[in-house]
């Protein structure tokens, strides 16, 4: 990028530069016509017959350098060939010399600084590449010369440029003074400011464009070269913030459109909102969950939104005394998650009708919550209690939902408690064909014993057909029609309203061999 300090092609008024000495044949300001057919201010000198060593000087106005360390001067000029000039003396030249003089203010006068090299600093002696020639009987031919010179290093506030003619016939058509600077550049979402190079190469720190953040690592920098070009060098640069994606050749960050999001800074583009979520504004880093849908704390920001599961289905119970086996089917709706678990709530109702949460005497295997399999075994049920179990399905977002958790209930009523086994059977009397038995009344927990059942069979006769039963409402019984001198095995069970209790231990009794012995009381 070039920044112009002076361009005579753009000047409309007289330039009024200073010439020295004030004599005939000096540089003269004239109107000229450029390539675009625009009138321009030019300076011409054509004193080809001057005395040797006599110089004509032309000095520009004071030019502030505006921070430039090196300034470039592009000269456009025409020059007549000495050979084409019949009256040109030996002092005719086809070159001229360019100088500059630095100062902190516009202090030069018609006589100062002295018109000579030192204090003026010589830039170059300029020779014409193209000379305007004229041969007798032919048209003149020639072209404009263009030469760019480099001034500097400059350190003061401004400078003058001076031209020294020592016998040329030439016109200075235009002078363009400029310095080179590295243009503002945006690369990899990093903006590097317009920079005037002060040295061969200058490091320049970059800053992130709007809605971008620095990438990890060293802060981005680029080198501005003296020729106004940025040195090619990879830039770590910046990346677009969450909710923004790179656009326009990585020069700006564009907000994610409605319905899209970008959760992290860095490369990558905005993505459509995941299932069950939406973004109603631009620049979303995360999509909001629809009503009734949630993300667990551990879910990534870009994860779909999920909902708690529906209730488990088809709870089946199998009661076995004080143990209960429950199993069920998975819910119809998992809520879109894999982390499904089950939990149970329990209430118990006493026979009298008062209900409360289940007591600590119940045990759940493998546990009452965080179940991953659809079953549980409950132990320690009390007889004649009604239990209500509510089976719920849970997942990672259940805790975020408000409102009741759906459940599948099951009611189980345990049997009342039957009388205990009858033991302590004793033979009160025996005969060859009968045995009289008695026993202690068992303590029935759920009401009185209604009756008893006696089961007996001859020892050794084990088949079902040999077993006989006898019911009695008293805590005694007489077994008749027995074999003489035979051994019998006897068991008794009691019945209450809850049903029959278990048979007690087998009791061994024997009938008499003959009747002469008579009835004989036996104590077991």
């Amino acid at each position: 990028l070039e920044e112009t300090l002076l361009n005579t092609k753009l000047e409309t008024a007289d330039l009024k530069w200073v010439t020295f000495p004030q004599v005939d044949g000096q540089w003269e300001e004239l109107s000229g016509l450029d390539e675009e057919q625009h009138s321009v201010r030019t300076y011409e000198v054509c004193d080809v017959q001057r005395a040797p060593g006599q110089a004509h000087w032309l000095r520009t106005g004071w030019v502030p350098r505006r921070g430039a360390v090196h300034v470039y001067a592009t000269l456009r000029f025409t020059m007549l060939e000495c050979l084409s000039l019949p009256r040109a003396g030996r002092s005719c030249k086809e070159t001229f010399t360019v100088f500059y003089y630095e100062s902190d203010a516009d202090t030069a006068t018609a006589l100062t600084p002295a018109w000579m090299e030192n204090p003026y600093i010589k830039v170059d002696t300029v020779a014409a590449e193209h000379l305007t020639r004229k041969r007798p009987g032919a048209e003149a031919t020639g072209k404009v010369n263009v030469k760019t010179l480099r001034l500097g290093p400059l350190s003061k506030a401004g400078f003058y440029l001076a031209f020294q003619d020592q016998g040329a016939c030439m016109a200075l058509l235009s002078l363009h003074l400029f310095y080179k600077k590295c243009a503002q550049l945006t690369v990899n979402l990093t903006r590097f400011p317009e920079t005037v190079p002060r040295e061969l190469v200058v490091p320049v720190a970059g800053s992130c464009v709007v809605d971008a953040v620095p990438a990890p690592g060293p802060s981005p920098s680029l080198y501005c070269r003296e020729d106004g070009q940025w040195a090619e060098q990879p830039v770590t640069g910046c990346s677009c913030a969450p909710g923004f994606e790179a656009a326009e050749g990585n020069t700006k960050c564009r907000a994610c459109a409605q319905g899209t999001f970008k959760p992290l800074s860095g490369e990558g583009s905005c993505q459509p909102c995941p299932a069950n979520s939406h973004s109603n504004t631009i620049g979303s880093a995360v999509c909001q969950c629809r009503v009734g849908y949630f993300r667990a704390r551990t879910d990534p920001r870009g994860a779909p939104c999920t909902t708690p599961p529906s209730a488990p289905r088809s709870v089946v119970s199998r009661l076995n005394g004080s143990s209960l086996h429950l199993e069920w089917s998975a819910p119809l709706e998992s809520g879109g998650r894999e982390d499904l678990t089950y939990a149970l709530r329990c209430r118990e109702c006493r026979p009298g009708g008062s209900c409360a949460p289940c007591g600590g005497d119940l045990t759940f295997d493998p546990g009452p919550r965080d179940l991953v399999e659809p079953w549980v075994v409950v132990r320690g049920l009390r007889p004649d209690f009604t239990y209500t179990f509510e089976v719920t399905a849970l997942n990672g977002v259940s805790s975020l939902a408000t409102g009741p958790v759906p459940f599948e209930p099951v009611n189980v009523t345990t049997d009342r408690e039957v009388p205990p086994a009858v033991s302590d059977i004793r033979v009160t009397r025996s005969s060859p064909s009968s045995l009289s038995l008695a026993w202690a009344v068992p303590r029935a927990p759920s009401g009185a014993v209604l009756d008893y059942e006696v089961k007996y069979h001859e020892k050794g006769a084990e088949g079902p057909s040999s077993v006989r039963f006898l019911k009695t409402s008293e805590n005694r019984a007489e077994l008749r029609g027995l074999k003489r001198g035979a051994s019998y095995l006897v068991q008794v069970r009691a019945r209450s309203e809850a049903g029959y209790g278990p048979f007690g231990q087998e009791h061994h009794s024997q009938t008499q061999l003959d009747e002469s012995e008579g009835w004989r009381e036996q104590l077991a």
């Epitope: 109107s31 000229g32 057919q37 030019t42 007549l80 000039l85 305007t132 004229k134 003149a140 016939c169």
Partner: antibody
Framework: QVELVQSGAEVKKPGSSVKVSCKAS????????ISWVRQAPGQGLEWMGR????????NYAQKFQGRVTITADESTSTAYMELSSLRSEDTAVYYC???????????????????WGQGTLVTVSS | DIQMTQSPSSLSASVGDRVTITCRAS??????LNWYQQKPGKAPKLLIY???ILQSGVPSRFSGSGSGTDFTLTISSLQPEDFATYYC??????????FGQGTKVEIK
Amino acid sequence: QVELVQSGAEVKKPGSSVKVSCKASGGTFSTYAISWVRQAPGQGLEWMGRIIPIFGTANYAQKFQGRVTITADESTSTAYMELSSLRSEDTAVYYCARSSYTILTTYYNYNAMDNWGQGTLVTVSS
Amino acid sequence: DIQMTQSPSSLSASVGDRVTITCRASQNINNFLNWYQQKPGKAPKLLIYGSSILQSGVPSRFSGSGSGTDFTLTISSLQPEDFATYYCQQNDFYSPSTFGQGTKVEIK
């Protein structure tokens, strides 16, 4: 503004010669083109010839070739037009005119004449 | 030498009229064509050079166009001071020049 000042009116005999001068006041002279144009009474403009003083040589219209000589003196910034073998039809106002731009200061060879002398009446009469 | 033919040789027009004068060269002159205005008893005045470039100080109602052999001078809205004779001229620095025969613009 440069001024071109021409010499005074002349009355000449047929067959004689006339030399008209044109002095440019101030500034560059050598690299401009100086043309001579004449205008007979009630007639149009007629270009006679041109000189670029720095080159020393002149161009002439075919019609005047051999009869007209255009010269320039750089030291006095004066151009001259001499017409010989005068005839009555050479009676006219003779103008000198300077080009708008020097040969060095125009990118194109446009040679328009924007500075004119006041004119010199030359009468050829026996 | 190159011949320049101007037309019309004269025309009558009123103030405010649009006036067009043409000039034809006998061979290609690129755009080395100038237009001059001359009033009686005065030296000619340059109006346009390079076929279309308006000389400094000349009103913008004057315009020129053309290249090669055919050229036009246009006065967009004729003013009282524009009644004069107009000449075209082919002219570069190095070859012989010629004028057209002139066009006299008179008041209608």
